[in-house]
Interface confidence: low
Amino acid sequence: HKCDITLQEIIKTLNSLTEQKTLCTELTVTDIFAASKNTTEKETFCRAATVLRQFYSHHEKDTRCLGATAQQFHRHKQLIRFLKRLDRNLWGLAGLNSCPVKEANQSTLENFLERLKTIMREKYSKCSS
């Protein structure tokens, strides 16, 4: 069966997100991937979206993330825009209203996005074969 267009959009967004670092991609987020053995795929996507929403809600207007130069400001704004798009598409893929995020483990946003990209690429390779 064909891959969901949303999945392709997610991978495209993740590729853009992981291409460049910003002042705040090294901040920590909840690592939902650390112990996700008994978690369904839909729950994983839902929880990933929740983590991203928490991040951009907290840091969208963080002056330390915005930086002190036009380039840093632009990069941070772009990061937030991509995270919002990713959040929206993950919710669509998950099809769940809400999901708990209780893990204590932390990961940098950068590592979180790389891990999510790996998962999405694996899913894409399965549905496209």
Partner: nanobody
Framework: EVQLLESGGGLVQPGGSLRLSCAAS????????MGWVRQAPGKGLEWVSF????????YYADSVKGRFTISRDNSKNTLYLQMNSLRAEDTAVYYC?????????WGQGTLVTVSS
């Protein structure tokens, strides 16, 4: 327990140089971006510089760009700030910070005084 210990501050004349160090312990240093922030007497906090975990990307406030250089040695768990062409307005307490943007851990700070 996370610990950040700054050193290298002191009194220096305008145009002079100083090198600040920050010895980190209690966490996986190489996994985190690190930064320097400062607080001038009677003023608020100002972020100075930031370096990513790998050390490949660095960022500077406009006020120090071209004069300050941030670096790190992950094998020694140490963060550095080389400060050249110092000015009176650089006088401040300089803090080493883990994960700039959230400031989850701080050092005690080291005082840099630029005066003739």
């Amino acid at each position: 327990e996370v610990q950040l210990l700054e050193s290298g501050g002191g009194l220096v004349q305008p145009g002079g140089s100083l090198r600040l160090s920050c010895a980190a312990s209690g966490f996986t240093f190489e996994a985190y971006g690190m930064g320097w922030v400062r607080q001038a007497p009677g003023k608020g906090l100002e972020w100075v510089s930031f370096i990513t975990s790998s050390g490949l990307s660095t960022y500077y406030a406009d006020s120090v760009k071209g004069r300050f250089t941030i670096s790190r040695d992950n094998s020694k768990n140490t963060l550095y700030l080389q400060m050249n062409s110092l000015r009176a307005e650089d006088t401040a307490v300089y803090y080493c910070a883990k994960s700039l943007g959230r400031f989850d851990y701080w050092g005690q700070g080291t005082l840099v005084t630029v005066s003739s």
